[in-house]
């Protein structure tokens, strides 16, 4: 009898270790998406950035989906969202048409069920980039903790997309699940 | 028999509580390192910052190692990495060599097994710090989610290190483990 | 006997699932507070911002308390703290008193037991907001990993509060618990 109980206990321990490990991993979706510069739109108006890498270099995704330029939530939860956006201009890349620039990022959430789009976070700066200087650079970082539901979509909008720095260490956004919804 | 089983159950519960608590803590390395201003290099070129506090004021470290100016990963996992770098200049510190500055931070990862160094995140701004103003200040913040392997090293490079703000609330970097690698 | 043991095992599994789920949720306090612009102080000096939303729009709080303009820790632990502060000015809002601005944020921790206040994180920039431009904008983001004890209070101080952007996506701060204290 006692031996049988110990066997059961071992089963409990074993299955629990598996369950705990498995559920922990499955409960923690994440994504880190880096800019795909082969398809950056021109213009100076606010545009949605739709081309991102999800599986090369630093880019990665797990238990979330990247589709049509949007990061799709597959699992309800509270997530920490972040974005780092770098803008740069070198005089060899053409003459700036204006010195007064609004360099901005907007992290937006779209709900498919109730078609609506809302800005979760924004950041940026107005800049005076004079033609007297051969190189200009500016980075924005935003981050925050948000409740996301399965099916909701996260996307990035920027002004002046043609000034984006195309490096994977410069222009990226991401998310990781921190906890369940009560 | 029934009493014996209950005792076994209590053991299961007890050991599980210990195991869960212990494994949870051990699975979560972290570090928050603050600038050690007694040894900041001069110059305006990009340099690696090697002097950081890990055990005074806000600085702390657990299940990671700080050695030779680098934060060493002891445990495979996905980590959130961050850095906050502040630059400042007061006219009492003397005239700036140039009014056009590139104030930058680079968070780099070095793999010892395959000797190589890569930039994970960068941020900053070109600035025009005119002599007309007696005080100048600028801060950069970067953050992102990265897969780190045991033995890999995180370091911080900045331009214009002589302009760094030496306060612990100003210039720091850190990491915390979010989840295991599948 | 064997049937009885299986019932006990089911109980162990069941109670463990409840316990694990419950303790996980309870172990993870969080807050995301957005600016309440109905009561922003004027002036250009450093002031503590006391009016924040905790339960509308993106604002939310769990297992932490918001009281008297401060975010109060209810549970010991290591927390990731963050703040995003946006400043803006449009010429239609009147002329700026000075073109040289110091736009800063300070995230402070106050301990009630040992009455003291310390800055955990700071960020910002000196800016030249010329009258030649009709619109100016600037955002600051800071974040870091800190040990917080029950009863300690987090608050936000800024310079030039009258220039704050009152949008919930622009000016906010927050915290989420990452792990227990050993």
């Amino acid at each position: 009898g006692s031996q049988h109980i110990r066997a059961e206990k071992a089963m409990v321990d074993g299955s629990w270790l598996d369950l705990a490990k498995r559920s922990k991993l499955e409960a923690q979706p994440f994504a880190h998406l880096t800019i795909n510069a082969t398809d950056i739109p021109s213009g100076s108006h606010k545009v949605s950035l739709s081309s991102w890498y999800h599986d090369r270099g630093w880019a990665k995704i797990s238990n979330m989906t990247f589709s049509n330029g949007k990061l799709i939530v597959n699992q309800d939860g509270f997530y920490y969202l972040y974005a780092n956006i770098c803008f740069r201009h070198h005089e060899t890349s053409g003459d700036l048409a204006t010195e007064y620039l609004q360099l901005m990022v907007y992290v937006t959430k779209t709900s498919i069920k109730i078609p609506s789009s809302h800005t979760l976070m924004k950041g940026g700066s107005t800049k005076y980039w004079s033609g007297n200087s051969e190189f200009h650079f500016y980075s924005i970082n935003v981050g925050g903790f948000f409740k996301l539901r399965s099916g909701e979509e996260i996307s990035i909008e920027v002004s002046n997309p043609s000034l984006l720095d195309p490096d994977q260490d410069a222009t990226y956004f991401g998310a990781f699940k921190v906890r369940d919804i009560d | 028999g029934s009493q014996h089983i209950r005792a076994e159950k209590a053991m299961v519960d007890g050991s599980w509580l210990d195991l869960a608590k212990r494994s949870k803590l051990e699975a979560q390395p972290f570090a928050h390192l603050t600038i050690n201003a007694t040894d900041i290099p001069s110059g305006s070129h990009k340099v690696s910052l090697s002097s950081w506090y890990h055990d005074r004021g806000w600085a702390k470290i657990s299940n990671m190692t700080f050695s030779n100016g680098k934060l060493i990963v002891n445990q495979d996992g996905f980590y959130y990495l961050y850095a906050n770098i502040c630059f400042r200049h007061h006219e009492t510190s003397g005239d700036l060599a140039t009014e056009y500055l590139q104030l930058m931070v680079y968070v780099t990862k070095t793999s010892i097994k395959i000797p190589s160094s890569h930039t994970l995140m960068k941020g900053g701004s070109t600035k025009y710090w005119s002599g007309n103003s007696e005080f100048h200040f600028y801060s950069i913040n970067v953050g992102g989610f990265f897969k780190l392997r045991s033995g890999e090293e995180i370091s911080i490079e900045v331009s214009n290190p002589s302009l760094l703000d030496p306060d612990q609330d100003a210039t720091y970097f850190g990491a915390f483990k979010v989840r295991d690698i599948d | 006997g064997s049937q009885h043991i299986r019932a006990e095992k089911a109980m162990v599994d069941g109670s463990w699932l409840d316990l694990a789920k419950r303790s996980k949720l309870e172990a993870q306090p969080f807050a995301h507070l957005t600016i309440n612009a109905t009561d922003i102080p004027s002036g250009s000096h450093k002031v503590s911002l006391s009016s924040w939303y905790h339960d509308r729009g993106w604002a939310k709080i769990s297992n932490m308390t918001f009281s008297n303009g401060k975010l109060i820790v209810n549970q010991d632990g290591f927390y990731y703290l963050y703040a995003n502060i946006c400043f803006r000015h449009h010429e239609t809002s009147g002329d700026l008193a000075t073109e040289y601005l110091q736009l800063m944020v300070y995230v402070t921790k106050t301990s009630i037991k040992i009455p003291s206040s310390h800055t955990l994180m700071k960020g910002g920039s000196t800016k030249y907001w010329s009258g030649n431009s009709e619109f100016h904008f600037y955002s600051i983001n800071v974040g870091g990993f800190f040990k917080l004890r029950s009863g300690e209070e987090i608050s936000i101080e800024v310079s030039n509060p009258s220039l704050l952007d009152p949008d919930q996506d622009a000016t906010y701060f927050g915290a989420f618990k990452v792990r227990d204290i050993d």
Partner: antibody, heavy 122, light 108 residues
Framework: EVQLLESGGGLVQPGGSLRLSCAAS????????MSWVRQAPGKGLEWVSG????????YYADSVKGRFTISRDNSKNTLYLQMNSLRAEDTAVYYC???????????????WGQGTLVTVSS | EIVLTQSPGTLSLSPGERATLSCRAS???????LAWYQQKPGQAPRLLIY???SRATGIPDRFSGSGSGTDFTLTISRLEPEDFAVFYC?????????FGQGTKVEIK
Amino acid sequence: EVQLLESGGGLVQPGGSLRLSCAASGFTFSAYPMSWVRQAPGKGLEWVSGITGSGGSTYYADSVKGRFTISRDNSKNTLYLQMNSLRAEDTAVYYCAKDPGTTVIMSWFDPWGQGTLVTVSS
Amino acid sequence: EIVLTQSPGTLSLSPGERATLSCRASQSVRGRYLAWYQQKPGQAPRLLIYGASSRATGIPDRFSGSGSGTDFTLTISRLEPEDFAVFYCQQYGSSPRTFGQGTKVEIK
């Protein structure tokens, strides 16, 4: 309708100076970058100089840098090109042209003025 | 600077025929930042295409642009009598902005 009308061209000796003007109408002049483009007789087009809407930044082709100065008076809706130390190879029809202002860098030219002929000869 | 080479130098065609003009860059043109102009004798150039393939306002749809990187093409699907002129390409992805030497489309 957008209109650009150049004036100030003529015959000048090598080493001499000339100031071209371009009167603009039909659009908010101060909001748009402007450029000068030239065309030597029987040859192709060459961009000469550009200026931002505010006039705060100016750009020049290497062939004219240090000799030509572009400027604008937004209160008069007029673009200028001051040409000093003129050379025979500067002989061309000079067109003023509006930038579309839709991109962050100076881009294409639309529309163009009818041009003014500058002849540098002794 | 980016050098643009247009070919052929001269294209002799009849009205109703298709014209294909080439513009090759010495290095990749960033962001497809290329424009095409038409210039008739004694007149100022007129914008036809920008962004490599976007037609300017009022330009007939028989004019079309294509290409990216270093190779760009202007196509006139059916030549009309008023289309005979000199055509120039221009890049604006790099400083300084540069033009091709031109392709003359003449009546055969």
